[in-house]
Amino acid sequence: REPTIQCGSETGPSPEWMVQHTLTPGDLRDLQVELVKTSVAAEEFSILMNISWILRADASIRLLKATKICVSGKNNMNSYSCVRCNYTEAFQSQTRPSGGKWTFSYVGFPVELSTLYLISAHNIPNANMNEDSPSLSVNFTSPGCLNHVMKYKKQCTEAGSLWDPDITACKKNEKMVEVNFTTNPLGNRYTILIQRDTTLGFSRVLENKLMRTSVAIPVTEESEGAVVQLTPYLHTCGNDCIRREGTVVLCSETSAPIPPDDNRRMLGG
């Protein structure tokens, strides 16, 4: 039978560390981390690390009992936890029967937003107490709310991560930029900035209806290539909502027309 892994928490040192070993398995060949979204309950998602590792293809894997993975996180709250993954069978070959290295993965360790994590892994039995223990480490910085996985976190959805404003912005003339976006059902207030090195134009928008809105914004100088920053003010995140960006391009003849005056928003300036 092919080896699989059974993983569980191991907070302290591994018991094998207390025992003298004449021979120990080699180090890991590779260690990688990616994010996965797992359903916790209806509409509830947890973002976890998917940690995968590759074993070195030589006879030393015959001694391999387990691999221990530890994760430390550094942001406003430091965290540290370890998991030990035991191999269910002894290795009968240095590569998988179908070809390629032995590769295993563990899904666990909840991930916070924009946090630096150090993930380290070593094989067990590891080197003796006074010897160098071969281990492999990788740094991983978790992304923010606009990441395709992180956007499902509750604090991200509340900050508007699932909203797609589909911003388009085009230069109508030297003095005017037209910005189109889809409003958010969770709020009705927005600010729009047009920036290069400085702010070229600014507008506040109030829009209750869930619709595609068009705003004409006066600008003070050349706007083509400038960045459009759209900030929503939603019930769930107040002033801490996720900002969205677009770029000003030249309006084409087929651009959506600026709506008539009763729909046009030109607040601020």
Epitope: L63, Q94, S98, G100, K101
Partner: antibody
Framework: QVQLVQSGAEVKKPGASVKVSCKAS????????MNWVRQAPGQGLEWMGR????????QYNQKFKDRVTMTRDTSISTAYMELSRLRSDDTAVYYC???????????WGQGTLVTVSS | DIQMTQSPSSLSASVGDRVTITCRAS??????LAWYQQKPGKAPKLLLY???NLADGVPSRFSGSGSGTDYTLTISSLQPEDFATYYC?????????FGGGTKVEIK
């Protein structure tokens, strides 16, 4: 049945390069490492390195690291060993040898005699 | 690198004799040892791996023993086709090395 068939004998001048091929059949080529071993006339066996046909990972004997290149073509189940900057003491029979479950050499090619002479 | 020292380098024996060849590793190779037989002008042939396991088609008169650093190949009753050179090889992680060989000749 497993077979490893190597390319024919070569005569090369010092400083030249030689490329030996090893065509595998009778098993799944990507499932086992391929090793290269050489034997100078009247001498013992010397491991040169190995390649994993699955992903082309290579491990060389440090002695040959700067002069040897191992490659493979999975579409034709063939491994290659190229030795550059040949010297007269590179005159030897070069064998490809397939690993077993671990790196015992369960199957061998017939050998390729490379003669380096000016 | 692990050195493999084989002894004797050559021996003379008669058909029916019991022959023993030893191989010593410069460090513990954890029984990751193979034995090969090579005849003139031919590729080596695997005899045993993991010290004691007979390769396919190898007669049971060949056996292996040992652990740690010291290993032995025994031919219980030498046959005419057994006159050849024998090599040990460790596979306890690259680089793999062979013993210098033992040539078994007819007395």
């Amino acid at each position: 049945q497993v077979q490893l068939v190597q390319s024919g004998a070569e005569v090369k001048k010092p400083g030249a390069s030689v490329k030996v091929s090893c065509k595998a059949s009778g098993y799944t080529f990507i499932s086992y490492w391929m090793n290269w071993v050489r034997q100078a006339p009247g001498q013992g066996l010397e491991w040169m390195g190995r390649i994993d046909p699955y992903d082309s990972e290579i491990q060389y004997n440090q002695k040959f690291k700067d002069r040897v290149t191992m490659t493979r073509d999975t579409s034709i189940s063939t491994a290659y060993m190229e030795l550059s900057r040949l010297r007269s003491d590179d005159t030897a029979v070069y064998y490809c040898a397939r690993s077993g479950g671990f790196d015992w050499f369960a199957y061998w090619g017939q050998g390729t005699l490379v003669t380096v002479s000016s | 690198d692990i050195q493999m020292t084989q002894s004797p380098s050559s021996l003379s024996a008669s058909v029916g004799d019991r022959v023993t060849i030893t191989c010593r590793a410069s460090e513990n190779i954890n029984s990751n040892l193979a034995w090969y037989q090579q005849k003139p002008g031919k590729a080596p042939k695997l005899l045993l791996y993991d010290v004691t396991n007979l390769a396919d088609g190898v007669p049971s008169r060949f056996s292996g023993s040992g652990s740690g650093t010291d290993y032995t190949l025994t031919i219980s009753s030498l046959q005419p086709e057994d006159f050849a050179t024998y090599y040990c090889q460790h596979f306890w992680g690259p680089p793999y090395t062979f013993g210098g060989g033992t040539k078994v000749e007819i007395k």
